[in-house]
């Protein structure tokens, strides 16, 4: 969210997406109400080819990296304001995500649903 | 790794102005930038934050409205552009690079050497 | 806002001493607390992050410590290079608030 002012409170802020290729498309920003949430990054790369980077807030958030046959997940989980800003870059064209989307349905989701 | 910031002068109240700061010796695009200030009584407060793309801004309440941070990466600049300058903005003007220890964690690791605003009639 | 409380603005010391400096903190904020030096120049420097973490080319003499709302930066064996006003800073939450300020003096 661009211009984004403060507003009181202590919900922790983070960036918030689902499924992009760049950190540039992930610029929504989260208020994460409930208490003990964290900001969490996933980042899915299919066989080489391609990053996907989804973001937000997760209540059970906890580091991991696992392989897949199609690919490898990393999360990444942090407790600041605006902590999950980075992710990796993506190097290839968004049409090549839609023909890769079904094989890493699974994957591209939150941690609470991984 | 430097950064250099110009652009400060004496301006009338009301009067609006931009800073800018040179960025030299590292990837500028890579790092989120903010401006800092401090004012006469030699207290430090942020007034603006911005991610690596230039994408995403951040203000405190006490400077919303007023402040515009930017940033131009393929000349390695950062902006700030002040309007409706009042008399409590009076300060000497830092920018910085955050840079990020951990998943969670991250300081402010370089700062340029400051340009003086002075706002008076 | 959380408020960033170093009671003591300035402080007077002699070489060779041994000086703390102390920050509070209106809430708890996890260690993400950093400490600044800027010189009478006005020139500022990193010198702690993460509470305790020296900052590439700061001298062992800077130490940190603290944690949930008390931190404390520690010189030992103070220099001449030394004299500076030093600032804490937090990382938690927005919008990141600095400490006043303390001034060290030489007696």
């Known amino acids: 969210m661009a211009g984004l002012a403060l507003q009181p409170g202590t919900a922790l802020l983070c960036y918030s997406c689902k499924a992009q290729v760049s950190n540039e498309d992930c610029l929504q920003v989260e208020n994460c109400t409930q208490l003990g949430e964290q900001c969490w990054t996933a980042r899915i790369r299919a066989v080489g080819l391609l990053t996907v980077i989804s973001k937000g807030c997760s209540l059970n958030c906890v580091d991991d990296s696992q392989d897949y046959y199609v690919g490898k997940k990393n999360i990444t989980c942090c407790d600041t304001d605006l902590c999950n800003a980075s992710g990796a870059h993506a190097l290839q064209p968004a049409a090549a995500i839609l023909a890769l989307l079904p094989a890493l349905g699974l994957l591209l989701w939150g941690p609470g649903q991984l | 790794v430097q950064l250099q910031e110009s652009g400060g002068v004496l301006v009338q109240p009301g009067g609006s102005l931009k800073l800018s700061c040179a960025a030299s010796?590292?990837?500028?695009?890579?790092?989120?930038m903010s401006w800092i200030r401090q004012t006469p009584d030699r207290r430090l407060e942020w007034v603006a934050y911005i991610n690596d793309s230039g994408g995403s801004t951040f203000y405190p309440d006490t400077v919303k409205g007023r402040f515009s941070i930017s940033r131009d990466n393929a000349k390695n600049t950062l902006y700030l552009q002040i309007s409706r300058l009042r008399s409590g903005d009076t300060a000497i003007y830092y920018c910085?690079?955050?840079?990020?220890?951990?998943?969670?964690?991250?300081?402010?690791?370089?700062w340029g050497a400051g340009t003086t605003v002075t706002v008076s009639s | 806002d959380i408020v960033m409380t170093q009671s003591t603005s300035s402080l007077s010391a002699s070489l060779g001493d041994r000086v703390t400096i102390n920050c509070g903190t209106s809430q708890d904020i996890n260690n993400y607390l950093n400490w600044y030096q800027q010189k009478p120049d006005g020139s500022v420097k990193l010198l702690i992050y993460?509470?305790?973490r020296l900052h590439s080319g700061v001298p062992s003499r800077f130490s940190g410590s603290g944690s949930g709302t008390d931190y404390s930066l520690t010189i030992s064996n103070l220099e001449q290079g030394d004299i500076a006003t030093y600032f804490c800073?937090?990382?938690?939450?927005?919008?990141?608030?600095f400490g006043g300020g303390t001034k060290l003096e030489l007696k």
């Open positions: 910085s690079r955050r840079m990020y220890y951990g998943n969670s964690h991250w300081h402010f690791d370089v």
């Open positions: 010796g590292f990837t500028f695009s890579s790092y989120s």
């Open positions: 993460y509470t305790s």
């Open positions: 800073q937090q990382s938690k939450t927005l919008p990141w608030t």
